[in-house]
């Protein structure tokens, strides 16, 4: 029996009836057998066929086989209902080795020209599986060139079987207080070979429930418990199961906060599996009751391990805890069923005593004494020195626990010295220097340190004076002795104050003339107004038309008088403006140097001469009336003069307050 | 982790102002509670002083509050105590306290001495 | 002002020994009181707030009671460490004040 080719040769070749292409003899039989490598099959398909036929193929034939079974017994030219002729049919072997055989018999009734055929080994595709058989692997299916592999979805293993796919389903822990867990794939079929665990770990003093719900489908046997595939519960008291089988298990309460799922599989089957839907439960805290004026959220039934409540308070009450105050209030459950806070309570809110309002009084409106939540106080300025600055000094104690205006500050308001107050009214006309009276120029500050000169009381506690006045004292404020509130220069009844520091203007240079002469003193403590220290205003924008030229302003000091020495009592003088071109032309001619009169001066006095400020006055205020306001301004400073004061032809020098307005309040504002 | 730290002189003459500061780093003092100056002295009595709250609301002891003036600054997450017109009596550990004192600082000795 | 009585200036004891610490309050103060444990050269320690909260971190056998006017802290099982002075606070009123302390000692 001729043998075909084997591996490793090329498998491939052709295969003919003897004496083919003429016609074959009688009684023949020659038989091949075809061998593929391991993984491929072989193919066959005819070019050429011509026996005689006969019925089932029983006189000549070729038949083809693998293994044991018969792949095709052909005969003919055509197929008929009986017999087989391959036609264009391509036969494959079942394995790698395909035998052909082929006989005739001991006649022709005429002449037969056989056949002829060819094979090739070609790949088995062993993914490709019939309808109805198993299929090759349990996921993915890989061909290749001689063979095949299985491969896993994620999730899954391969089983050393190198078919089955086992699920990766240990390690799972679920944390929370409720939860699904389930057989791999449900609810379609679980895997087959599989080992599963699953736990659920909560906090100690809870306790897990187990609920099996929607189906439950675990391969059984009708004598055996559980032998195939199985599920088991175990905590650290005791074990439930194993459960298999298609009734739903009945709920476990476990009483463990602790609980290991074990879920194992075999090699067959198909079953749907199973879902277990877990809560927990523990030791229920009290009931929270609401403080009084509070509420609790959120509101629950019970509340156990782990759950909290929050207190909020109504409007205008606040979270205490005794004496101590919270912004916000929550509580724990805890393992022993208590809660980790008392309770706090809802008080109404407090503002407290209002505080002390410097030169001012607070008045209660809601009652005496009353700080709660809505109470009413006033604010008031001590009347006639004093006005309030900014608000109207009503104030609500808000649910902040802050006394709040209606403009919603939560500062107090200011009680701002009243300026330009004086005993004295305007003469209208020049007559000589005056002994003052007490209150009328109550805005005179006497600075002894050094020289004697003078200043003018900004609100309560700022001076204002002259630079060259003050200069050698600009980096020792403390060596000023400021004195107020006194007529006599020598009397020992005055009110002291100290200064704090001492701005001189930027523009002013010492000994090389007076422009920019003008300097604020800051004060260390405010000053107490009353009828005898009031400050002085300063001058509208308006107050240029009250200094117009030949307008009387009042200058006031203790300074030289015609006798030559200080004045032992304050004196004052009304003088005129001077137009400011002849004031100029004044002081043009010798000794003096040319533009020592600037735009930031003002010249105030008489022609004739003898009404003067003089030394000792320098730093004083040159004041006004306000005719509208019925307030005394300051519209200069007393500067400089001619050395004889009160020259005839010569005039007093003022630095001109109005051209300082934004210097005075920027450093009053910035310090 | 809540800590407060006070930082003060050491050292005040009397019939000076004492200031003090406290620190507090691991929460903010706008959050929540208030926050406390309390002081310890020699022989180891612990006397309250007062608190600034969440909100910046004060509370002093009234033994103290003419001379007391607690404040904060809460960009720096600090609050301070100034007490004016100090006496030889005033001599001792201050220590700043979260809420009902469950967090302190390690305290701050002041001498009040000429 | 509520005033802090803390009547026993020192009490003594051994290793392991349960021993109770009181405080008596003036006036009612609910159970808004701490209870604080300070070491020489060191800063109080909380203990014990609302009458008997354990503050976090302290060991169980630090136990506070009562309410009203009558406080008390329960060492059970002392040892060498809580060998040091107690301090009783009422934070119920304005002022919050202190007792006078205990000294706890070793017999």
């Known amino acids: 029996t001729p043998l075909g080719p084997k591996w490793p040769e090329p498998v491939f070749g052709r295969l003919a009836s003897p004496g083919f292409p003429g016609e074959y003899a009688n009684d023949q039989e020659r038989r091949w057998t075809l061998t593929a490598p391991p993984g491929y099959r072989l193919r066959l398909y005819f070019t050429h066929f011509d026996l005689e036929l006969s019925h089932l193929c029983e006189y000549d034939f070729v038949k083809l086989s693998s293994g044991a079974k018969v792949l095709a017994t052909l005969c003919g030219q055509e197929s008929t209902d009986t017999e087989r002729a391959p036609g264009k049919d391509t036969f494959y072997s079942l394995g790698s080795s395909l035998d052909i055989t082929f006989r005739s018999d001991y006649s022709n009734e005429k002449p037969f020209t056989g056949f002829e055929a060819f094979y090739a080994a070609e790949d088995i595709d062993e993914c490709q599986v019939a309808p109805g058989e198993a299929p090759t692997c349990d996921h993915h299916c890989h061909n290749h060139l001689g063979g095949f592999y299985c491969s896993c979805r994620a999730g899954y293993v391969l089983h050393r079987n190198k078919r089955t796919c086992s699920a990766l389903c240990s390690g799972q822990v679920f944390t929370q207080r409720s939860g699904e867990l389930s057989s791999p794939e449900y609810p379609r079929p679980y895997p087959k070979l599989s080992s599963c665990t699953y736990s659920i770990s909560l906090e100690e003093g809870f306790s897990v429930i187990l609920d099996f719900v929607e189906s439950f489908d675990v391969e059984t046997h009708p004598e055996t418990l559980c032998p195939y595939d199985f599920l088991k519960i175990q905590t650290d008291r005791e074990e439930h199961g194993p459960f298999c089988g298609k009734t739903l298990p009945h709920r476990i309460e476990t009483k463990s906060n602790t609980v290991t799922i074990t879920f194992v599989t075999d090699e067959s089957g198909d079953h749907t599996g199973w879902k277990i839907h877990y809560t927990s439960t523990a030791q229920p805290c009290p009931y929270p009751m609401a403080p009084p004026n509070g509420h609790v959220s959120p509101v629950q039934a019970k509340y156990i391990l782990k759950d909290s409540f929050s207190i909020f308070c109504e409007t205008g009450y606040e979270l205490l805890q005794g004496h101590l105050p919270l912004k916000s209030f929550t509580a724990v459950c805890q393992k022993d069923g208590s809660w980790d806070r008392p309770m706090p309570a809802c008080s109404i809110v407090d503002c407290g005593p209002p505080d002390d309002l410097p030169s001012g009084r607070v008045e209660y409106i809601t009652g005496p004494g009353v700080t709660t939540y809505k109470a009413v106080i006033q604010y008031s300025c001590e009347e006639t020195f004093y006005t309030m600055k900014v608000n109207d000094g009503k104030y609500v104690c808000e649910a902040d626990g802050f006394w709040t205006s209606s403009k919603g500050e939560k500062s107090l308001p200011v009680c701002e010295p009243v300026c330009g107050l004086s005993a004295r009214t305007t003469g209208g006309r020049i007559y000589g220097g005056q002994k003052a009276k007490p209150g009328d120029f109550p805005w005179q500050v006497l600075i002894l340190g050094g020289t004697t000169a003078a200043g003018a009381l900004l609100y309560d506690n700022w001076v204002l004076t002259a630079a060259h006045a003050v200069y050698e004292q600009k980096h020792d404020a403390s060596a000023l002795d400021i004195r107020m509130g006194t007529l006599k220069r020598l009397s020992p009844h005055y009110t002291q104050a100290w200064s704090e520091a001492v701005f001189i203007h930027e523009g002013y240079t010492h000994d090389a003339g007076f422009d920019n002469d003008i300097a604020l003193i800051k004060l260390n403590n405010k000053v107490v107004i009353n009828s005898n220290i009031t400050p002085i205003c300063l001058p509208r924008k308006e107050a240029e038309s009250f200094m117009r030229t030949d307008d009387i302003g009042t200058a006031s000091g203790w300074g030289l008088t015609q006798r030559g020495f200080l004045a032992r009592n304050l004196m004052y003088v009304d003088i005129p403006i001077v137009d400011h071109q002849k004031c100029t032309a004044a002081y043009e001619k010798p000794p003096y140097p040319r533009g020592s009169v600037t735009a930031n001066m003002l010249c105030a006095g008489l022609e004739s001469g003898g009404k003067d400020s003089c030394r000792g006055d320098s730093g004083g205020a040159l004041v006004f009336l306000d005719s509208e306001t019925e307030r005394w301004f300051v519209g200069g400073i007393v500067s400089w003069g001619s050395m004889n004061c009160g020259e005839a032809g010569q005039y007093g020098v003022y630095t001109k307050v109005i051209n300082y307005i934004p210097w005075i309040e920027n450093i009053i504002s910035d310090f | 982790d809540v800590q407060l730290q006070e930082s003060g002189p050491g050292l005040v003459k009397p019939s000076q102002s004492l200031s003090l500061t406290c620190t507090v780093t691991g929460y903010s003092i706008t959050s929540d509670y208030a926050w406390n100056w309390i002081r310890q002295f020699p022989g180891n009595k612990l006397e309250w002083m007062g608190y600034i709250s969440y909100s910046g609301r004060t509370s002093y002891n009234p033994y103290l509050k003419s001379r007391i003036s607690i404040t904060r600054d809460t960009s720096k997450n600090q609050f301070f105590l100034q007490l004016n017109s100090v006496t030889t009596e005033d001599t001792a550990t201050y220590y700043c306290?979260?809420?009902?004192?469950?967090?302190w600082g390690q305290g701050t000795t002041l001498t009040v001495s000429s | 002002d509520i005033v802090m009585t803390q009547s026993q200036k020192f009490m003594s004891t051994s290793v392991g020994d349960r021993v109770s610490v009181t405080c008596k309050a003036s006036q009612n103060v609910g159970t808004n009181v701490a209870w604080y444990k300070q070491k020489p050269g060191q800063s109080p320690k909380a203990l014990i707030y609302?009458?008997?909260y354990r503050h976090s971190g302290v060991p169980d056998r630090f136990t506070g009671s009562g309410s009203g006017t009558d406080f008390t802290l329960t060492i059970s099982n002392v040892q060498s460490e809580d060998l040091a002075e107690y301090f009783c606070?009422?934070?119920?009123?304005?002022?919050?004040?202190f007792g006078a302390g205990t000294k706890l000692e070793l017999k």
């Open positions: 609302s009458a008997s």
């Open positions: 306290a979260r809420y009902w004192g469950d967090y």
């Open positions: 606070l009422q934070y119920n009123s304005n002022p919050l004040t």
